[in-house]
């Protein structure tokens, strides 16, 4: 698993809707793979973390002034939808094929 | 200034090109305002940090399992260009009006 010492990468994060209180309106699935972006954005930033110019600059400044400026952060840079069965306002079970932005597709340094 | 205890916000970060070794090709300006995104992504995530659904989910999971899952991260969500004077292959000073992605326009929780 990706700890603080490892490079920015996508790791598993199973989310149970009951744990976050969303089971009141999401009927199914009971849980889903959300993924999580974990790990550090270390110098030099690799191409696979698709760094912006600002992230590159911040990384270089952090290298020179580590106490003054933080590293870039490993975050989702592309998200995917999931399909959910939910209750609408009338309590009717309705399928939303593309509930956007729920699962990490790619991680990067920002 | 925005510390770890404050909410995610844009703070000043003056970057000197000499400090990061870019003065070899960027002639001017000598320094610029890059800004930095600092502060925490605390529950509940406010609208001004424009959270994605995944960031909201991760924040809720962190609330329940703080040691297992990290908080969302405060990062640049919109970047602005700067203008730079650089030397081309022939050594001719050339102005690039829009050197993209160099300065933070907006921060958010991701």
């Amino acid at each position: 698993s990706a700890g603080a010492g490892s490079h920015c990468q996508k790791t598993s994060l199973r989310v149970n809707f009951e744990d976050i209180g969303w089971d009141s309106w999401i009927i199914a699935p009971k849980e889903y793979e959300a993924y999580e972006c974990k790990g550090g954005c270390f110098f030099p930033l690799a191409d696979d973390v698709t760094p912006t110019k600002h992230a590159i600059v911040q990384t270089l400044v952090h290298l020179k002034f580590p106490t003054k400026v933080g590293k870039a952060c490993c975050v989702p840079t592309k998200l995917s939808p999931i399909s959910v069965l939910y209750k609408d306002d009338m309590g009717v079970p309705t399928l939303k094929y593309h509930y956007e932005g729920m699962s990490v597709a790619e991680c990067g340094c920002r | 200034s925005a510390g770890a205890g404050s909410h995610c916000q844009k703070t000043s970060l003056r970057v000197n090109f000499e400090d990061i070794g870019w003065d070899s090709w960027i002639i001017a300006p000598k320094e610029y305002e890059a800004y930095e995104c600092k502060g925490g992504c605390f529950f509940p995530l406010a609208d001004d940090v424009t959270p994605t659904k995944h960031a909201i989910v991760q924040t809720l999971v962190h609330l329940k399992f703080p040691t297992k899952v990290g908080k969302a991260c405060c990062v640049p969500t919109k970047l602005s260009p700067i203008s730079v004077l650089y030397k081309d292959d022939m050594g001719v000073p050339t102005l690039k009006y829009h050197y993209e992605g160099m300065s933070v326009a907006e921060c958010g929780c991701r």
């Epitope: - | 002639i27 001017a28 300006p29 000598k30 320094e31 610029y32 700067i82 203008s83 730079v84 004077l85 081309d88 022939m90 001719v92 000073p93 050339t94 102005l95």
Partner: antibody
């Protein structure tokens, strides 16, 4: 070695026309703005016109004193820039330099060619 | 148009001494943290040659005795130590706005 070579100028009567040309070598011509700058004892150094790149749709700009009378053009395939001068006046007399450069500076200069407008 | 006023119009300096030429713009030639000010040297019968760009950066092959400074509206060119080869006309030039304009020039001679 960078070289800019202007065509021979000469004497022309007021109201007359002349076309100057300039051939470049030693650099990638199509990557640079091309300009004409003139010099006279009365007016000193004076930018006349420039033509930008293909990516800028070969946009042109002129000094107010020559607008409507002079036309700058370029042929990237021949690494050449031209200045068509019409309705010439006595105050257009001077040494005409072909210069190449960026959107920031006149980097390369020709040796210049003398244009004399006189009856 | 941005008007550039150079002073003095002519200057005689002893060999080994410092020559200072000033250029004042009718409005600021700075933008984006960049000074759009250049200096050219011209010797008789030759085209101008780029000496200094962006106020303080030396052109290619320019000796270290040539230096530039300033920002906004006030700029200067320094030559130290003065050498015989430095006898020439010197022009400031701005590229912030079209039309790009030149100063009237300063004639530098040896005293």
């Amino acid at each position: 070695e960078v070289k800019l070579e202007e065509s021979r100028g000469g004497l022309v009567q007021p109201g007359g026309s002349m076309k100057l040309s300039c051939v470049a070598s030693g650099f990638t011509f199509s990557n640079y703005w091309m300009n004409w700058v003139r010099q006279s004892p009365e007016k000193g150094l004076e930018w006349v016109a420039h033509i930008r790149l293909k990516s800028d749709n070969y946009a042109t700009h002129y000094a107010e004193s020559v607008r409507g009378r002079f036309t700058i053009s370029r042929d990237d395939s021949k690494s050449s820039v031209f200045l068509q001068m019409n309705n010439l006046r006595a105050e257009d007399t001077g040494i005409y330099y072909c210069t190449g450069g960026s959107n920031y500076v006149f980097a390369f200069w020709g040796q210049g060619t003398l244009v004399t407008v006189s009856a | 148009d941005i008007v550039l006023t150079q002073s003095p119009a002519s200057l005689a300096v002893s060999l080994g001494q410092r020559a200072t030429i000033s250029c004042r713009a009718s409005e600021s030639v700075d933008n984006y943290g960049i000074s759009f000010m250049n200096w050219f040297q011209q010797k008789p019968g030759q085209p101008p040659k780029l000496l200094i760009y962006a106020a303080s950066n030396q052109g290619s092959g320019v000796p270290a005795r040539f230096s530039g400074s300033g920002s906004g509206t006030d700029f200067s060119l320094n030559i130290h130590p003065m050498e015989e080869d430095d006898t020439a006309m010197y022009f400031c030039q701005q590229s912030k706005e079209v039309p790009w304009t030149f100063g009237g020039g300063t004639k530098l001679e040896i005293k």
